[in-house]
Interface confidence: low
């Protein structure tokens, strides 16, 4: 276990021509904050892919209003480090994304607005326990200077934080098979501590806190023998001793989710749904406060009222979950009024309004005939806030620009013949069928499958589809 630490030194205009103008002014007072996302390995995944090693959000920096006449300086930064705790081994190679966010504090409708100013990314090799590494990254005309390191949390040591050290119990030597913890010669390497309750006979661990099962045993603590019904399992190799299939390792076998998290398999891995107060790939990070940056996707973290809820994430639109980690289908709330089509674009929710309506949620009724013309002799009709053209014979569409052929779609079923009519179309049905589109068979006994006819219309009448 350990902590990745990031120290931002400066964020400001980079060298060379085309220096950016300050994002803050008297007109747009603002403050900065940073988000770091870590992924194991030298991945080149999209910025939106999960921060499997963890993520952190900085505090907000000081409110800044650029002084008149001053050149665009380095912008004031939040205090403190960004810390990303990791429970498992430090991978040695990692990818990072550092985002610089601006929080506008002007006279905004609906509270402060956040916008991404710059995003830098890189892939690095880093041994835990080493010195601070310095870096400079540029994003457009902006330049970010920062340092980072990975350090192990006691009792872990080593370049991957996988070795555990304990103070020597005797001054002379360490226990059998255990080496001194160089350079801490007064400490000894400690045996791995597996997950509490892990079966000493049927389980083992390669990293602290895990419990991996020997063949033939399963369960979170390797106490459950694999039953003979496993012969039906489609997964895993055939066992030479039993002649039946022994399940191979599934992503959720042994339940990798700690602290009461529930595991669900994904096509290539697993996903833990964590209870409040825990997060991380395996719900392994606990005792979380806002300083740990537990809120993802731009969620705003506020301190909770009691120790069991040390923080609460207020999620931006489009995200939910105790850590704002889940994308929500905002269109399911049906925010678009007056029949507008909802589009969830991720960064924004858009409503595509029906004719005659406008506004972010299609809430405005338009006088749509104003300044509008209906083509080909059509006349504009107002009604219900919607612009509608009453088209001359032979034309259709919203503005009567389309030449109408009501029979083009072959609307008459069961071999019925279609005739264009001044008010729509008429289907002449083949023998044995009836209905506006010849859709109902006439039963041999004379009854029909047609539902009860509306008043004034007999089931046998030819029907006009309007």
């Amino acid at each position: 276990a350990g902590v990745f630490e990031l120290q931002i030194h400066s964020f400001g205009p980079g060298p060379g021509p085309g220096a950016p103008r300050s994002p803050c002014s008297a007109r747009l007072p603002c403050r900065l904050f940073f988000r770091v996302c870590l992924k194991p390995g030298l991945s080149e995944e999209a910025a939106e892919s999960p921060c499997a090693l963890g993520a952190a959000l900085s505090a907000r920096g000081p409110v800044y209003t650029e002084q008149p006449g001053a050149p665009a300086p380095d912008l004031p930064l939040p205090d403190g480090l960004l810390q990303v705790p990791f429970r498992d081994a430090w991978p040695g190679t990692f990818s990072f994304i550092i985002e610089t966010w601006r929080e506008e504090l002007g006279d905004q409708i609906g509270g402060p607005a956040w916008s991404l100013l710059a995003r830098v990314a890189g892939r690095r090799r880093l041994a835990a326990g080493g010195p601070w590494a310095r870096d400079i990254q540029r994003a457009g005309a902006w330049e970010l200077r920062f340092s980072y390191r990975a350090r192990c949390e006691p009792p872990a040591v080593g370049t991957a934080c996988t070795r555990l050290c304990r103070p020597r119990s005797a001054p002379s030597r360490c226990g059998p098979g255990l080496r001194p913890c160089a350079p801490l010669e007064d400490e000894c390497e400690a045996p791995l501590v597996c997950r509490a309750g892990c079966s000493p006979e049927h389980g083992f661990c390669e990293q602290p806190g895990e419990c991996r099962c020997l063949e033939g045993w399963t369960g979170p603590l390797c106490t459950v023998p694999v039953s003979t019904s496993s012969c039906l399992s489609p997964r895993g190799p055939s066992s030479a001793t039993t002649g039946c299939l022994v399940p191979g390792p599934g992503p959720c076998d042994g339940n990798p989710c700690a602290n009461g998290g529930s595991c669900s398999e994904t096509p290539r891995s697993f996903e833990c749904t964590c209870p409040r107060g825990f997060y991380g790939l395996r719900c392994e990070v606990s005792g979380v406060t806002c300083a740990d940056g537990p809120c993802f996707n731009g969620g705003l973290c506020v301190g909770g009222a009691d120790p069991d809820s040390a923080y609460i994430c207020h999620c931006p639109p489009g995200f939910q979950g105790s850590n704002c980690e889940k994308r929500v289908d905002r269109c399911s709330l049906q925010p678009c009024r007056n029949g507008g089509l909802c589009l969830d674009l991720g960064h924004a929710l858009r409503c595509r309004c029906r004719a005659g309506f406008a506004g972010p949620r299609c809430e405005h009724d338009l006088d749509d005939c104003a300044g509008r013309a209906c083509a080909n002799g059509g006349t504009c009709v107002e009604g219900g806030g919607a612009h509608r053209c009453s088209c001359a014979l032979g034309f259709g569409g919203r503005d009567c620009r389309e030449r109408a052929d009501p029979c083009a779609a072959r609307p008459c079923a069961h071999g019925g013949r279609c005739y264009a009519h001044f008010s729509g179309l008429v289907c002449a049905c083949a023998p044995g069928y009836m209905g506006a589109r010849c859709e109902f068979p006439v039963h041999p006994d004379g009854a029909s499958a047609l539902p009860a006819a509306p008043p004034g219309l007999r089931p046998g009448d030819p029907q006009r589809y309007l």
């Epitope: 103008r21 008297a26 007109r27 008149p68 001053a70 506008e104 006279d107 924004a348």
Partner: antibody, heavy 119, light 107 residues
Framework: QVQLQQWGAGLLKPSETLSLTCAVY????????WSWIRQPPGKGLEWIGE???????NYNPSLKSRVSISVDTSKNQFSLKLSSVTAADTAVYYC?????????????WGQGTLVTVSS | AIQMTQSPSSLSASVGDRVAITCRAS??????LGWYQQKPGKAPKLLIY???SLQSGVPSRFSGSRSDTDFTLTISSLQPEDFATYYC?????????FGGGTKVEIK
Amino acid sequence: QVQLQQWGAGLLKPSETLSLTCAVYGGSFSGYYWSWIRQPPGKGLEWIGEIIHSGSSNYNPSLKSRVSISVDTSKNQFSLKLSSVTAADTAVYYCSRGEYGSGSRFDYWGQGTLVTVSS
Amino acid sequence: AIQMTQSPSSLSASVGDRVAITCRASQGIRDDLGWYQQKPGKAPKLLIYAASSLQSGVPSRFSGSRSDTDFTLTISSLQPEDFATYYCLQDYDYPLTFGGGTKVEIK
């Protein structure tokens, strides 16, 4: 090529509400200020207000009680409403695009709409 | 509100003349000022933004400068198509304010 096309009623009676819409073609809608500016006949330019794609808006205090600017990002349009108009509101009204945080840079303008207020 | 005092309100000049128009801000506005040209019946056209940056497509005879709260638009050699009205605009703070305009006429 970015184009701003505006429309709305050109003749109003006192106390009515002026309503204009500006459609943006051929460019990004986010990342810019979208402003309304007016010019009474023979006089100078006056900034009315602005909006950004998220709906955040700012108005000239001299008009704030009567003005409302809204945005419809699905159509790349923004609209101006000015209530209780008087003859003093007679002007050519322009919509314009301003770069976000880049200095005074109203780089694209609508063609202008002459609005006359007369009883 | 920030007041933008533009001078002169009008001037007469000949083709080839060097012309300077000034705007003074009532307080510091960094370099958040632009210059616009307007011809009768047309929308204004951006010439200079951020006090001294030439807008793309604008002839290089137009230039802008700043000294504290005084801003100057200079036309190095007046051309026939330059006869128009010129406005400055500050967007440092709300409300955005224009200068009163300078009408450049043919002498």
